[in-house]
């Protein structure tokens, strides 16, 4: 019958090869010369070769030995024609399943597990687990079933079974009671692996189980009185460091201190952090503190871990005594910014306002005032009474010092004191439009033809703001209305000149008088250059030449 | 019938190289897997050689490994020995020979003389 | 490597006459071995494979069996063209290893 059982062939055979496996043979080979082949993964695609067959015995050939743990099954069809190629069977499934041997050693997923137990736990308490891997079959035969076993405890302290491993899952659990951090902080276990469940192939990993430490020491304060000198006004002053011990393990949270200012902070002046490697608590100031109004601050402190106590301890309190010092204060300008409205244009020595500073110091000091920042040069100054007045003409149109109406003053007030210290102040002055901005055409230049000229259409300027601007008037002067008309559209920002009689080619000059809504008058002198042409026109054509 | 014939023996010096041939008929030559073995002068038989019938692997024993290489060509139905670092004791009549049967060596040639000699 | 020890190294014989040739395997072959015979001029040709199944035009004058590790070629009645050398070969261990060859000679 042509059909064929699975083949099972065991990796790593020795050879010789060629090696036969098993002989196809069709019952239609009577009468009839019959050739065989083989196709599929291994035959005539990838892996090619590993399986051939005699083309005219039948023979199934395998070319190599085999890797289970690299093709565990190969799934080949055998054919069968007659001389004429014609198929003389269906395709024959042919399974050649490659068995295992143990060949390959269980390997630990790591060299080094690293796990953690608290102090003092029961018999029972679940480690860590370890896992090890082995290549061969564990489904059929034992070769990849592993079994764990402790093979060794390093210290052997109080006794050398503290901890077991479940043979099959590779679990590590305490078994014993007595795991004491300030006696042994750290075991060290040689582990095991087999194949063959515990029979075979044996190798060794570390497991490294940290003994934590539970929380059954609390910190304390060591002194628990300390005083303390701080210069008034000074943020993020470093007051005092507070010194704690802690028996528990350092670095962890059973060590690591939590410090709570419990009095004596009722404006909450002072913050306490913990310094990360000493574990001192750093007092500091949160904000600045006044002599003037305290010069003593008494403060209690208290001390717990990160970690909660495992058991009921007394918490350790200190006593702080801080002491202010006083410092000579900068004088502090009221308001910091002032705003002051005045016109611009005033005359020189006019008063613009009196801008003064107060000084935080108990002691009756004398204050002076100076400019430090005035960009265009326009103010003064007393030193005494901090009245400021005009040294130059202000000028709201100035670009170059003013922005948005506002010219910007930096003012400085200086005390007595030793050392004097100095406070600033920042004027800001808005400065009142007057209409001293006549309007302004633009452009200046025209060109136009003589001949059914086009309208030129010039834009009105004015610096100043309104009312001071808009609606605009427009005259002719000197005798320009003889040739030109002048008119102001109805937004009035914007005036339309003519030319309204025959100019032969040349420039002229038209002279303009725009004035604004407050009757400030401009004269302007438009250039305007009269060309030989009809309609609309850029420059003037040159002369024309006969040909 | 199945005929297989060498050639390609020669004279050669020590540490030279030689390559044989073996030019096979009367069967489907890809099919089968061929060896070389050689004879020495004293009449002992050795295997040198093995390639499986596409060519993908190829087999040798410890004496020649490294120094000779099987190769077969399924398109000139032709078998190859290239032969190098030859030594006095390499000189034999080499034979190729088919497996059938899945089994060495079915078929023989009549063989052909290898001399390494200075 | 697996050593095969053939004997007698070379037989006296009359026609008609029945012998039989031995291979010793130094180590387990199974029914892995074939027997070959060599002409004078060099002619190869094998006689019997995997222990005992016969090629096809062979003589049924020629047999083989086993016995342990010992495998035989027996020539039940020698014929005229049967006094040449003999050999084994094992194909059950690598590398392939020859026995050193029977010369069979006429009385």
């Known amino acids: 019958e042509w059909v064929m059982p699975p083949i099972f062939v065991p990796e790593n055979g020795k050879g010789p090869f060629p090696q036969r496996l098993n002989q196809l043979k069709s019952n239609k080979d009577r009468g009839t010369k019959i050739f065989y082949s083989i196709t599929g993964p291994g035959a005539d695609s990838p892996p090619e070769g590993v399986f051939a067959v005699e083309k005219e015995t039948g023979w199934l050939l395998l070319n190599k030995p085999l890797d289970r743990e690299e093709i565990a099954k190969y799934e080949l069809f055998g054919h069968a024609v007659s001389e004429n190629g014609a198929s003389v069977e269906d395709p024959m499934n042919i399974s050649i399943i490659v068995t295992d041997q143990n060949d390959h050693k269980p390997k630990f997923t790591q060299d080094t597990f690293r796990g953690s137990v608290l102090e003092g736990v029961l018999p029972g308490t679940s480690v860590m687990q370890v896992t090890a891997t082995d290549e061969d079959d564990a489904i059929y035969t034992y070769n990849g079933v592993v079994a764990y076993s402790i093979h060794s405890q390093e210290p052997k302290d109080p006794h050398d079974l503290m901890f077991t491993i479940h043979r099959s899952t590779g679990t590590i659990s305490v078994i014993s009671s007595g795991l004491d951090r300030e006696k042994v902080p750290e075991y060290t276990l040689t582990i095991q692996a087999t194949d063959m469940d515990g029979d075979g192939s044996t190798t060794t990993a570390v497991a490294v189980v940290e003994i934590l430490d539970a929380n059954d020491n609390a910190p304390m304060f060591d002194p628990q009185k300390y005083e303390a000198h701080v210069p008034e006004n000074a943020v993020g002053h470093e007051v005092q460091r507070l010194t704690v011990t802690d028996l528990d393990a350092p670095n962890s949270p059973a060590w690591r201190a939590t410090y709570l200012i419990m009095g004596g902070d009722d404006g909450d002046h002072f913050t306490i952090t913990t310094h990360p490697e000493s574990n001192q608590g750093i007092l500091t100031t949160r904000k600045g503190l006044d002599f003037e109004a305290k010069n003593q601050h008494t403060l209690y402190v208290e001390v717990t871990n990160e970690a909660p106590f495992v058991l009921k301890l007394p918490t350790s309190t200190a006593t702080i005594v801080v002491h202010v010092e006083d410092v000579n204060e900068a004088p502090v300008f009221v308001p910091p910014s002032k705003v002051v409205e005045v016109q611009e244009g005033i005359p020189t020595g006019e008063p613009v306002c009196v801008y003064t500073a107060e000084d935080p110091d108990k002691e009756n000091q004398k204050i002076s005032y100076r400019i430090l920042r005035d960009p265009a040069g326009w103010l003064a100054m007393d030193p005494d009474s901090g009245q400021v007045t005009a040294v130059g003409t202000l000028d709201r149109e100035d670009e170059q010092f003013v922005r948005n109406n506002i010219y910007e003053v930096m003012v400085l007030a200086m005390d007595n004191g030793s050392p004097p210290t100095t406070g600033t102040g920042t004027l800001l002055l808005t400065l009142i439009d007057v209409n001293d901005h006549g309007p302004v055409p633009e452009p200046r230049q025209i060109t136009i033809c003589n001949q059914s000229p086009v309208r030129q259409v010039l834009n009105i300027t004015d610096k100043d703001l309104s009312p001071h601007t808009s609606p605009f008037q427009a005259q002719l002067t000197d005798d320009s209305d003889i040739y030109w008309t002048a008119e102001v559209n109805e937004e009035g920002d914007t005036v339309v000149l003519s030319l309204k009689k025959f100019l032969k080619q040349d420039t002229y000059d038209v002279h303009l008088s725009l004035s604004d809504h407050g009757n400030k008058e401009q004269l302007t002198v438009i250039r305007a250059t009269v060309c030989d042409c009809h309609g609309h026109v850029e420059t003037c054509p040159g002369p024309w030449k006969g040909g | 019938v199945q005929l297989v014939e060498e050639s390609g023996g020669g004279l050669v010096k020590p540490g030279g190289s030689l390559k044989l041939s073996c030019a096979a008929s009367g069967f489907t030559f890809s099919s089968y897997a061929m060896s070389w073995v050689r004879q020495t002068p004293d009449k002992r038989l050795e295997w040198v050689a093995t390639?499986?019938?596409?060519?993908?692997?190829?087999y040798y024993p410890d004496s020649v490994k490294g120094r000779f290489t099987i190769s077969r060509d399924n398109a000139k139905n032709t078998l190859y020995l290239q032969m190098s670092s030859l030594k006095s004791e390499d000189t034999a009549m080499y034979y190729c020979?088919?497996?059938?049967?899945?089994?060495?060596?079915?078929?023989w040639g009549q063989g052909t003389t290898v001399t390494v000699s200075s | 490597e697996l050593v095969m020890t053939q004997s007698p190294s070379s037989l006296s014989a009359s026609l008609g006459e029945g012998v039989s040739l031995t291979c010793r395997a130094s180590?387990?072959?199974?029914?892995?071995l074939i027997w070959l015979r060599q002409e004078p001029d060099g002619t190869i040709k094998r006689l019997i494979y995997?222990?005992?199944s016969l090629d096809s035009g062979v003589p049924k004058r020629f047999s083989g069996s086993r016995s342990g590790s010992d495998y035989s070629l027996t020539i039940s009645s020698l014929e005229s063209e049967d006094f040449v050398h003999y050999y084994c070969?094992?194909?059950?261990?690598?590398?392939?290893?020859f026995g050193a060859g029977t010369k069979l000679e006429i009385k």
């Open positions: 390639i499986s019938s596409g060519g993908h692997y190829t």
């Open positions: 995997d222990t005992s």
């Open positions: 180590q387990d072959i199974g029914i892995n």
């Open positions: 020979a088919s497996y059938y049967y899945g089994i060495p060596f079915g078929y």
């Open positions: 070969l094992q194909y059950g261990s690598s590398p392939l290893t």
